[in-house]
């Protein structure tokens, strides 16, 4: 049976009884090998008589002495089987064996949980020689035990390639409970149940768990570790921790905050990054997410003109990257812009509204009803048109650009004229006779040049022809009208 020794027990005797060969307590060791830097198995030098191989944990010598008495089987002496002590205490234990002097080159090594202990362990092997046998004591000490020192320790001795193994010495290091699983912070839906888990281990066992919510014990009775706390639901933020108790005392887990998911706060700092005639690039700083990730955002745009109908345009976008280009806006217009974002709980309120304006743009349509006719008397071409609708001018008209292309007998040349915004007619000199003149007109604002009107062609005859009628912008579907006079 395993004997058990608690840390309060008196020091263990090195071995239960005297060694064969009547080892006296006043003998001093012949050889003492402390292993400081690296573990070196102790070598025992004895008279050179070979031992025989054996099987198992006991070596049965086959050699007989001069009187032909058989040698006893070799085995480690029984020692303490179980040592229980607290963390950071010191411990020393040993293996002992008596080896007939006929054996040579014996080595003792320490093993823990099946692995040889190499390195800076405090292992000392002492030899006490006598006439027929040498008593060997292998001591192992740990100055400040830790949980990692828990385990089963054995001695192994090699004699002529045969192995003798001692009984195990179980070291049990006891201390305060050690958490293997602590509760985790969570974001939960209001009034919805959730679980928290806490697990701690000894030794010593058992480990009992108490849950604490906002500094108040939750469970009246301790629960054996591991413990799962089911919280039926919260209406406000709470802090949970768990206490782990064993016979050595108490360890408290980290406190974790359980947050209640809520609608987000409205975005802040909505700002204009860039404006064009028909788009505005905005950015914003997201508000507090309400402990639930943002899903998407909504940009609300309304015309700031008091005469507008007050309708709101809504643009939906992803929550990232807190940037959105609002398109399809009118040029040179004022808008109020607000941003709202949503998480799984719902939509935030709208951010504070900001005012933004689009810039002037090039007109979006060409002048209308372009007509061209030849004034033969002055050798000019007269051009007339209607200005584009105000809404589609996309700014303040500063004038018009007229393109007239003259084509005759394989020669073509284009001329551009700029005219002021006043009026809606222009006159250009005939450049080439017996040629076709193609006219296109574009409106111009400070924002740029708009699209050119559809081409209107007029044939300019040689001198002496009569001016009958104008050419005009074709009706849709008609191509390249040519008026030959």
């Amino acid at each position: 049976a395993i004997t058990e020794a608690r840390e309060e027990a008196k020091p263990y005797p090195l071995f239960p009884g005297p060694f064969p060969g009547s080892l006296q307590t006043d003998h001093t060791p012949l050889l003492s090998l402390p292993h400081a830097s690296g573990y070196q198995p102790a070598l025992m030098f004895s008279p050179t008589q070979p031992g025989r191989p054996h099987t198992g944990n006991v070596a049965i010598p086959q050699v007989t002495s001069v009187e032909s008495k058989p040698l006893p089987p070799l085995a480690f002496k029984h020692t303490v089987g179980h040592i229980i002590l607290s963390e950071h205490k010191g411990v020393k234990f040993n293996c002992s064996i008596s080896v007939p002097n006929i054996y040579q080159d014996t080595t003792i090594s320490w093993w823990k949980d099946g692995k040889e202990l190499l390195g800076a362990h405090h292992a000392i092997t002492q030899f006490y020689p006598d006439d027929e046998v040498t008593a060997i004591i292998a001591s192992f000490s740990i100055t400040s035990v830790q949980r990692s020192d828990n385990g089963s320790y054995i001695c192994k001795m090699k004699i002529n390639n045969e192995e003798i193994v001692s009984d195990p010495i179980y070291i049990e290091v006891q201390g305060l409970p050690h958490f293997t699983k602590q509760p985790e912070s969570m974001n939960v839906t209001r009034n919805t149940a959730f679980n928290l888990t806490c697990q701690a281990v000894g030794p010593p066992e058992p480990v009992n768990i108490f849950w604490v919510q906002n500094s108040s014990r939750v469970n009246e009775q301790p629960e054996k570790s591991p413990s799962v706390l089911t919280v039926p639901g919260l209406t406000e933020m709470a802090v949970f921790s768990c206490e782990a108790h064993n016979d050595k005392g108490l360890t408290v887990s980290k406190g974790v905050q359980i947050n209640i998911k809520a609608i987000p706060s409205p975005p802040t700092e909505v700002s204009i990054r860039n404006s064009t005639a028909h788009s505005i690039l905005i950015s914003w700083v997201p508000g507090f997410d309400g402990y639930s990730p943002f899903r998407n955002c909504s940009i609300q745009v309304k015309e700031a003109d008091p005469l507008s109908n007050g309708s709101v345009m809504i643009f939906n976008t992803s929550a990232l990257p807190h940037l959105y280009q609002i398109k399809q806006l009118q040029a040179l217009a004022n808008y109020s812009i607000g941003v709202s974002c949503m998480n799984e709980i719902g939509w935030s309120a709208v951010s504070p509204w900001i005012l933004a304006s689009t810039t002037e743009g090039a007109p979006s349509v060409a002048p209308l009803n372009v007509t061209v006719f030849l004034n033969e008397s002055s050798d000019n071409v007269d051009i007339r048109w209607m200005k584009p609708p105000t809404k589609q001018q996309d700014g303040e008209l500063v004038g018009y650009r007229i393109s007239h292309v003259w084509q005759s007998a394989g020669i073509s040349k284009e001329l551009l004229e700029e005219v002021g915004q006043n009026g809606s007619r222009a006159r250009i000199s005939v450049q080439v006779h017996n040629a076709t003149c193609t006219v296109r007109i574009a409106a111009v604002t400070r924002g740029g040049v708009g699209p050119f009107s559809d081409p209107v062609k007029i044939f300019i005859p040689a001198h002496g022809w009569v001016d009958y009628a104008p050419s005009s912008t074709p009706a849709p579907g008609n191509a390249d009208p040519v008026l030959i006079i």
């Epitope: 009992n208 014990r217 939750v218 009246e220 009775q221 108790h245």
Partner: antibody, heavy 117, light 108 residues
């Protein structure tokens, strides 16, 4: 570890009230379940009630319902047991106890209440 | 409420002897939530056993608890002089929590 220290002995007249205090020392940042138990001279233990630390809910034994009030002052880590309409049979040692590591494993030293005209 | 009946009322034994104390409940005790306390004159009770069979910290292993449902037992394997006292069982599985009337262990 937690210790419970109770107020001193009281002598009361029948019909009066008594308020016994029980101060927690040690781990005062946690509010524990608190119990009150009494023991009349030469008699056994009698459970009076429990003060739950969550919202300070209380459960009283039927026998004391309407006469006993258990409260907590978090700022001083003290719980109180007030017993009203005292009778001579309320003469007893009153104990507070708590669950620290195991159920009711820490007890106060007891407060003797004597009801005598 | 659950009524706990302890027997015997008094147990007269000598040091070194084994003491067996019984506690019977009028109905099943939930989760075996039954505790045993020791009380000496002029002192507060001291928890020995909780959960019917688990020893509290610092309680010598000569004290052991057993039983379930309605029948529970406290055993002191070898009485020491300091073990002579009154022992109470208490159920804490339902309200009101109730105590047995006690068993006095006295020196024979």
């Amino acid at each position: 570890q937690v210790q419970l220290v109770q107020s001193g002995a009281e002598v009361k007249k029948p019909g009066a009230s008594v308020k016994v205090s029980c101060k927690t020392s040690g781990n005062t940042q946690i509010r524990y379940y608190m119990y009150w138990v009494r023991q009349a001279p030469g008699q056994g233990l009698e459970w009076m009630g429990i003060l739950n630390p969550n919202q300070d809910q209380t459960t009283y034994a039927q026998k004391f319902q309407g006469r006993v009030t258990m409260t907590r002052d978090t700022s001083t880590s003290t719980v109180y047991m007030e017993l009203s309409s005292l009778r001579s049979e309320d003469t007893a040692v009153y104990y507070c106890a708590t669950t620290y590591r195991y159920y009711m494993d820490v007890w106060g030293q007891g407060t003797t209440v004597t009801v005598s005209s | 409420e659950i009524v706990l009946t302890q027997s015997p009322g008094t147990l007269s034994l000598s040091p070194g002897e084994r003491a067996t104390l019984s506690c019977r409940a009028s109905q099943s005790v939930r989760s075996n939530y039954l505790a045993w306390y020791q009380q000496k004159p002029g002192q507060a009770p001291r928890l020995l056993i909780y959960g019917a069979s688990s020893r509290a910290t610092g309680i010598p292993d000569r004290f052991s608890g057993s039983g379930s449902g309605t029948d529970f037992t406290l055993t002191i394997s070898r009485l020491e002089p300091e073990d002579f006292a009154v022992y109470y069982c208490q159920q804490y599985g339902s309200s009101p929590r109730t105590f047995g009337q006690g068993t006095k262990v006295e020196i024979k």
